[in-house]
Amino acid sequence: SGTTNTVAAYNLTWKSTNFKTILEWEPKPINQVYTVQISTKSGDWKSKCFYTADTECDLTDEIVKDVKQTYLARVFSYPAGHVESTGSTEEPPYENSPEFTPYLETNLGQPTIQSFEQVGTKVNVTVQDEWTLVRRNDTFLSLRDVFGKDLIYTLYYWKSSSSGKKTAKTNTNEFLIDVDKGENYCFSVQAVIPSRRTANRKSTDSPVECMGHEKGESRE
């Protein structure tokens, strides 16, 4: 039959950052192609990435419809050159993915310090709010829109002349911190979802930004 020489996909893995979500799998195809299906636990299967020779499929458009749902995907293997025929009744080999709940499992992307402004002994540090592909009423939502107060930022700040890192935290995208007058400070931020308990609860640190460089303003 037409599927006897095909190999089922394996090592199905979700790769997701700020809700941009790709399903990856193995093996690299030899004389076969793949089609992916995705569904919620209670929903119907929807096919994506038809007869592809790739070993990944971007499922962002599907999961952003409801990021709090739990999704399951499966990858079907077909012989190369396969054409869908109404007469074929044999189900091709397939493999299921692990379940995936975007709200709980998407990784937090590296944040960026948008700006900082010093007024006397106070510095206001603003974290850039990243846009996601999640929509509400035809409007794209930011990371803050999606996570609300579940998302916090930790600011690490230190005198340029010192190694000890002070911390501040916010559940907005702004920090207002006290600094010593006449001292230059450096800043780095980290996104955190404290309610998570696994490795994806923190982002990597933002690039370090220091006073005296272009992102900052100083006013007396």
């Epitope: 930790t154 000890g164 890192k165 911390t167 935290k169 980290q190 404290p194 490795a199």
Partner: antibody, heavy 120, light 107 residues
Framework: EVQLVESGGGLVQPGGSLRLACAAS????????IHWVRQAPGKGLEWVGY????????YYADSVKGRFTISADTSKNTAYLQMNSLRAEDTAVYYC?????????????WGQGTLVTVSS | DIQMTQSPSSLSASVGDRVTITCRAS??????VAWYQQKPGKAPKLLIY???FLYSGVPSRFSGSRSGTDFTLTISSLQPEDFATYYC?????????FGQGTKVEIK
Amino acid sequence: EVQLVESGGGLVQPGGSLRLACAASGFTIGVYIIHWVRQAPGKGLEWVGYIDPSNGYTYYADSVKGRFTISADTSKNTAYLQMNSLRAEDTAVYYCARDDQSVSSPFDYWGQGTLVTVSS
Amino acid sequence: DIQMTQSPSSLSASVGDRVTITCRASQDVNTAVAWYQQKPGKAPKLLIYSASFLYSGVPSRFSGSRSGTDFTLTISSLQPEDFATYYCQQHYTTPPTFGQGTKVEIK
């Protein structure tokens, strides 16, 4: 079950060194912040310092700065407090504690403590 | 550094009494205040976080409140197991600082 277990305390002479360990189980230290807090006999709680194992960032209380160093080994899920140039006033029970890194950052889990006595 | 001034340093009370402990921060700390209970020879245990939120597993007789830079821990009806020392702590900024402690003793 989340657990922190300190070890390495003991009697040391003034000027000596000691390394305390804080072994974590039930969670990954790499995605939390770990603090060291001490309590001198009959006294209150004094914060010593912290480490964020994800980036190695640390900060120390003025009373220990330059003498104490906090480090972490994420592969062993353990944080350390290296104490050098010890003084009599460093005598205390030393606790490690986990910071949940929420906005208010309470220390939600503490170890049982290990006693360090600095005396000749 | 932010100072946390806790009062009283000790108090005597009876089972069933309502007990109030206060902490005053030397500057604004928003709601970043926690309360801990410590019994002799044991590690502190978290009771209240974010000034007024009861930590998981803590009896509802414990409560916390905030008024500006003043923070209060209230035990509505003191139980025998509540005799201990209580500490407030701010973690609004580094370094986090503790109050001096309040020892609650049996009258």
